[in-house]
């Protein structure tokens, strides 16, 4: 599998409609919780919780502050922590408790505390519960939590130093935790937790399971340096601990390695960054998407692997366990255990089969089963991804968070759309198209290029958004910017399953927002733009330039995958003279204007889609030289290189009208300007000319010129 290409389109922060929420002097907007039925987004930040309108997050509904007392701050600072940053209350747990309350925990100046937030009054109840084991002490430490039937399941650190990791269930009747032992958790960095409910038609009286995802220091691989390993762990909701062995500890805690690697190379992605569980009516078993980076990431690599939950469950239900053996100098080595395992199976949830054998609860389990799972929490079998390879591998980017939406294209094909955020405040939208990855677009969510800390996807039909939290605020973005595709070709070439071209309105529309039937809409996920209807020509605009001055002819081609080239009077613009230059990769600069520059200029684009090349006339300019008594100077046009486009400036190439496709562009010089051959100088005149540029607007003013199968390029 090759690296994913660059995003086809880059939307700058100012180019698209993004809604923002931030409050002065409030930072670290890292906890997001969506209540779809109330259309409310809850935001947990440093020392504050907000409720905002989920359809327009700039509309604040409620706010409540949870600040640390000066006394607590002082005590925290005495322990060597920063009073300005660390000794504050970072909200780390924001979970639904009931229809009218949220369960909220914060670091609370290294004395983690939890409270209930009443959603009617939007006030804390003042319970001030000990947050130890539910929330980290240190805002820099990893954490994850999920609320399951009123009980909080957490993965975090249990002490001030952060040296004792714990996966626990906070329950009044049956609190449970992991053993504090290296085989159970070895310096984990917690990433995600979620509950997977038993299927309603499950015949074997199965239990709900809670899955935890984390990266930890490997016990099974021995190298000079510490090897990190991504893990999936699982506990059973019905677990009540053991009677003597594993008393008040999980009897169902099992963990396995998550594999995400590129089989054809030595690329191993072993640091887990984020996980998203995809549930969809069409999915019998949930699929989870995991985002990874390699341990030694000096080149900025990221990967996404997708896993069937049934694969993980198979490993836990039928896989082999690992055993530890001590070798010289108290060194421990982990190897596969091939012998018989006790019955009932260690780590198994209590199902109807276990109940039939009189094991009605984990409290009834025989000591040998409990002792075995206590000693062997690690599975030897690994959880492998769907198709045994990553869905996406991207170079020169550090992805931070992922959400996935399953959507249906017009032709009925189902696509898993991956929304992946970066450490530079951008959001990539990607899909798998016939075993290749297509990054539809990149949107700069945060102007300051700060890392996205949290991503959330609304699942309500109709108004659907992605919410992103960072240190400075929250941004709300639609799932697609269909309306920004001004032509049918643009709309089709976007290959965005959310978008289709509507001929009657001549607009690119969002599929999930169209009430009307999809009949007549145009969407070709193959990118075949030949399905687009012919277009009428656009209107002209006039510009005036001073004789001897410079003209800039605009070519608004948003696609980063397209190569732009120019034609003049159906002739080839060759790349060797100071006469021409390129501005911002696409706009043509004509220097030292004279009558000989009059004529028709066409900006064309060439975009490779699968094994075809799409050519389009993007813009058409007519320059007329006219004598004017007094020259009018055109305003200077500044063109900014699009951030994130990551394509080198190309040299102009042209071809005769209707001839075979143009020759490939030559790389531009480091200045970004290009040079083309001089044309014969026109006969000079004593008066300064008026140059009128009759411009077809920067839309594709003609139908695709030709769609040609081309050789491997």
């Amino acid at each position: 599998m090759a690296f994913a290409p660059i995003p086809r389109i880059t939307w700058e922060h100012r180019e698209v409609h993004l809604v923002q929420f931030h409050e002065p002097d409030i930072y670290n907007y890292s906890a997001l919780l969506l209540s779809e039925d109330k259309d409310t987004l809850y935001i947990g930040a440093r020392e504050a919780v907000f409720a905002v309108n989920a359809l327009n997050i700039s509309e604040k509904q409620h706010e409540v502050y949870w600040k640390v007392s000066e006394d607590k701050k002082a005590k925290c600072a005495e322990k060597g922590k920063s009073k300005q940053t660390e000794c504050l209350n970072y909200i780390r747990v924001l979970q639904p408790l009931s229809a009218t309350s949220l369960y909220v925990c914060g670091t609370n100046a290294f004395q983690p505390a939890c409270d209930h937030l009443n959603l009617t009054s939007f006030k804390f109840l003042g319970k001030n519960e000990d947050g130890k084991g539910r929330c980290p002490f240190d805002p820099a430490h990893s954490y994850t939590s999920v609320m399951v039937d009123g009980e909080l399941y957490s993965g975090t650190s249990y002490n001030f130093l952060g040296s004792e990791p714990i996966i626990s269930r906070n329950s009044s009747h049956s609190p449970l935790r992991t053993e504090y032992a290296i085989p159970w958790l070895n310096e984990p960095s917690f990433v995600f937790a979620d509950v997977i409910r038993k299927s309603p038609d499950s015949p074997d009286g199965e239990d709900d399971r809670v899955y935890f995802f984390f990266t930890e220091v490997s016990v099974e691989y021995e190298f000079v340096f510490r090897v990190l390993i991504p893990r999936i762990a699982r506990v059973c909701k019905g677990d009540q601990g053991g009677l003597r062995t594993l008393q008040k500890k999980w009897t169902s805690f099992l963990k396995a390695r998550l594999i995400c690697s590129r089989p054809d190379s030595g690329l191993v992605f072993n640091v887990l960054r984020d996980v998203f569980v995809l549930r969809s009516p069409g999915l019998k078993v949930p699929v989870f998407y995991a985002l990874f980076t390699p341990q030694l990431n000096n080149v900025g690599l990221s990967a996404v692997c997708a896993y069937n939950l049934s694969t993980a469950e198979e490993v836990f239900s039928h896989g082999k366990y690992m055993q530890s053996t001590t070798v010289e100098q108290s060194h421990t080595k982990w190897v596969r255990y091939n012998g018989p395992v006790p019955k009932p199976r260690p780590g198994a949830c209590i199902d109807s089969e276990a109940r039939a054998a009189n094991y009605t609860s984990s409290l009834n389990l025989p000591d040998k089963t409990l002792q075995f799972v206590k000693d062997h929490p690690l599975m030897d079998d690994s959880v492998t991804p769907i198709d045994n390879r990553p869905r996406l591998i991207k170079k020169d980017v550090n992805y931070t968070q992922i959400v996935v939406d399953r959507t249906q294209a017009l032709d009925g094909t189902v696509y898993d759309v991956m929304f992946v955020s970066t450490d530079r405040g951008a959001l990539h939208k990607a899909i798998s198209l016939e075993h290749a990855v297509h990054i539809i677009e990149e949107t700069q969510l945060f102007q300051d290029f700060e890392p996205v800390q949290t991503l959330l996807l609304s699942s309500k039909k109709g108004n659907r958004f992605v919410y992103a939290g960072s240190n400075s605020g929250v941004v709300q973005a639609p799932l697609a910017f269909c309306g920004k595709h001004g032509t049918c070709e643009d709309c089709v070439l976007a290959r965005d399953p959310y978008c289709a071209w509507s001929p009657p309105t001549a607009t690119c529309v969002a599929l999930h927002q169209t009430e009307s039937p999809s009949r007549g809409l145009i969407q070709e996920m193959s990118g075949d733009a030949s399905v687009c209807p012919d277009k009428s020509k656009g209107s002209y605009r006039q510009h005036f330039f001073k004789h001897g001055g410079t003209a800039e002819l605009k070519c608004s081609q948003k696609s980063n995958l397209a190569r732009v080239f120019w034609k003049f009077q159906n002739g080839v613009l060759k790349a060797e003279s100071p006469k021409y230059g390129l501005m911002g990769r696409k706009n043509l600069l004509i220097f030292n204007l004279s009558e000989g520059d009059s004529g028709v200029y066409q900006c064309l684009s060439e975009e490779r889609v699968k094994n075809k090349t799409v050519f389009q006339v993007v813009a058409k300019h007519v320059l007329e030289v006219k004598v004017v008594p007094k020259p009018v100077v055109a305003p200077t046009l500044s063109v900014v290189q699009t951030e994130g486009s990551r394509i080198a400036t190309k040299v102009l190439v042209a071809s005769t009208q209707g001839s075979s496709p143009p020759t490939p562009a030559v790389q531009a010089t480091s200045s970004g300007a290009i040079t083309l051959p001089p044309k014969p100088a026109p006969t000079g005149t004593s008066c300064e000319p008026k140059i009128v540029i009759n411009t077809v607007p920067q839309l594709h003013s003609e139908k695709t010129m030709y769609l040609k199968s081309s050789d491997n390029r």
Epitope: T325, N338, K343, Q371, H376
Partner: antibody
Framework: EVQLQQSGAELVRPGASVKLSCTTS????????MYWVKQRPEQGLEWIAW????????EYASKFQGKATITADTSSNTVYLQLSNLTSEDTAVYFC??????????WGQGTLVTVSA | EIVLTQSPTTMAASPGEKITITCSAS???????LHWFQQKPRFSPKLLIY???NLASGVPARFSGSGSGTSYSLTIGTMEAEDVATYYC?????????FGTGTKLELK
């Protein structure tokens, strides 16, 4: 009370086969793993094979592959060991035993197999 | 396969004496799968110690076990006449399961 009752002693000719049985009481063999162990006269103990009667999964020591066959009948709570193509080397006491993570907790009384012309 | 070598092969001791039998594995094994058995003449083996150091049901407290990796030992705190038997260590860490060579304990 857990008991493992083995079949009686066998005197067999070289080249013949023999099938030993081990009937259990006090537990259901489906809930355990069952093993056979060999002890030649004045010698040590050798593990032959194990079976999981619940699913008939078996595992043999390589030296007993082709020589021994372990089977189970859950309806009668009985485990069997069939030994084929017998030679004087197969003269030994054969024990059935059960257990796993807690070691071989319960043992049968042993069955003496004598191979003689 | 894992070879378990016991020493001594034979030993004689007086009642009240402290006895230590060692079991050396050819490769490192998990202490969770090392067990000790006692076998008296014309009897089936009897489980004494399981998982290196756990006393089996009904076994007197004078018996104890320890060890890790490749080195394990069985100790009888104060020898009694009824302890005359052959003692075997056994590993279940790796297939095939193997027993030790045996140590015959006699009365002096």
């Amino acid at each position: 009370e857990v008991q493992l009752q083995q079949s009686g002693a066998e005197l067999v000719r070289p080249g013949a086969s023999v099938k030993l049985s081990c009937t259990t009481s006090g537990f259901n063999i489906k809930d355990e793993h069952m093993y056979w162990v060999k002890q030649r006269p004045e010698q040590g103990l050798e593990w032959i094979a194990w079976i999981d009667p619940e699913n008939d999964n078996t595992e043999y020591a390589s030296k007993f592959q082709g020589k021994a066959t372990i089977t189970a009948d859950t309806s009668s709570n009985t485990v069997y060991l069939q030994l084929s193509n017998l030679t004087s080397e197969d003269t030994a006491v054969y024990f059935c035993t059960t257990g796993d993570y807690d070691g071989f907790t319960y043992w049968g009384q042993g069955t003496l197999v004598t191979v003689s012309a | 396969e894992i070879v378990l070598t016991q020493s001594p092969t034979t030993m004689a001791a007086s009642p009240g004496e402290k006895i230590t039998i060692t079991c050396s594995a050819s490769s490192s094994i998990s202490s969770n799968f090392l067990h000790w058995f006692q076998q008296k003449p014309r009897f089936s083996p009897k489980l004494l110690i399981y998982r290196t150091s756990n006393l089996a049901s009904g076994v007197p407290a004078r018996f104890s076990g320890s060890g890790s990796g490749t080195s394990y030992s069985l100790t009888i705190g104060t020898m009694e006449a009824e302890d005359v038997a052959t003692y075997y260590c056994q590993q279940g860490s790796f297939m095939p399961f193997t027993f030790g060579t045996g140590t015959k304990l006699e009365l002096k």
